[in-house]
Interface confidence: low
């Protein structure tokens, strides 16, 4: 399974957070993405593998990091009223 | 709109260097990945390497490893490929091209014609 | 390396008739569910212009006599129907495995 947290997050503009996701099937590939009103699911980040990682649609104003198989985090270094979103994490072989 | 623009033709004498630019806008360059691109006259394309600007990462083709050295400044939108000891083989037209799509490039600069010549 | 042969070097078509280009990789430029080839196109005197990305996706502002078909080590584009602003070259280009290369190109010419 692939289990995302915080379920629900509510912040300060400019507060740094982190969203973990994580997943126990020896998955290789992990991907971040945000789902907005009339522009459907766009991907943030994707990682292939262990420290491979990669920009997707809308990368700006986010960072990643893949040091282990199981785990992607999801990093907003600066949060900003745009960045108010539903995200999704999703892992593949 | 996204533009790419590069520098002005060089005319350079065999065994120089010389250092060309990219410059982005419409978009942040540390957003995407950068590249270079050489097409020598009536050939072909060939990839010189990329960089990442968000945190100055590259990777070349290994036969440009030691000619080609790519760099970028984000406070300037601008990438840069400079080329060293130059031999006459390499006159040529250097394209600079962004990154996107997983790695297409989509958008390229006009190109910089660079002249090894005595 | 990944090599890339096109195929033919140059091709003559019709106005209005179909075009068809070849793209062979040494190797398999597939991966995680996509395919890693792209196509563009590059009249005289001008750069390269993004046609189709991941093998099938056309381009954003390109018109859709363009489609690229392919997967792992056969690719194709195809122009149908041909216009008179299609003469160009063509190329392939995979981002599948470091260092990505190109297809030698394909001269397109109306007959």
């Known amino acids: 399974q692939v289990t995302q947290n915080p379920r629900y997050l509510i912040t300060v503009t400019g507060k740094k957070l982190t969203v973990t996701c994580s997943q126990n099937m020896n998955h290789e590939y992990m991907s971040w993405y945000r789902q907005d009103p009339g522009l459907g699911l766009r991907q943030i980040y994707y990682s292939m593998n262990v420290e491979v990682t990669d920009k997707g649609d809308v990368p700006e104003g986010y960072k990643v990091s893949r040091k282990e198989k199981r785990n992607f985090p999801l990093i907003l270094e600066s949060p900003s009223p745009n960045q108010t979103s539903l995200y999704f994490c999703a892992s593949s072989l | 709109e996204v533009q790419l623009q590069q520098s002005g033709a060089e005319l350079v004498k065999p065994g120089a260097s010389v250092k060309l630019s990219c410059t982005a806008s419409g978009f942040k360059t540390e957003d995407t990945y950068m590249y270079w691109v050489k097409q020598r006259p009536e050939q072909g394309l060939e990839w010189i390497g990329r960089?990442?600007?968000?945190?100055?990462?590259?990777k070349y083709d290994p036969k440009f490893q030691d000619k080609a050295t790519i760099t970028a400044d984000s406070s300037s939108n601008t990438a840069y490929l400079q080329l060293s000891s130059l031999p006459s083989e390499d006159t040529a037209v250097y394209y600079c091209?962004?990154?996107?799509?997983?790695?297409?490039?989509?958008?390229w600069g006009q190109g910089t014609s660079v002249t090894v010549s005595s | 390396d990944i090599v890339l042969t096109q195929s033919p070097a140059s091709l003559a078509v019709s106005l209005g008739q179909r075009a068809t280009i070849s793209c062979r990789a040494s190797?398999?430029?597939?991966?995680?569910?996509?395919?890693?080839m792209h196509w563009y196109q590059q009249k005289p005197g001008q750069p390269p212009k993004l046609l189709i990305y991941?093998?099938?996706n056309l381009e954003s502002g390109i018109p859709a006599r363009f489609s690229g078909s392919g997967s792992r080590t056969d690719f194709t584009l195809t122009i149908n129907p041909v216009e008179a602003d299609d003469v160009a070259t063509y190329y392939c280009?995979?981002?599948?495995?470091?260092?990505?290369?190109f297809g030698g190109g394909t001269k397109l010419e109306i007959k």
């Open positions: 960089i990442d600007p968000a945190n100055g990462n590259t």
């Open positions: 091209a962004r990154g996107s799509y997983y790695y297409a490039m989509d958008y």
């Open positions: 991941r093998a099938s």
């Open positions: 190797e398999s430029v597939d991966s995680y569910g996509n395919s890693f």
């Open positions: 280009q995979q981002s599948n495995e470091d260092p990505y290369t």
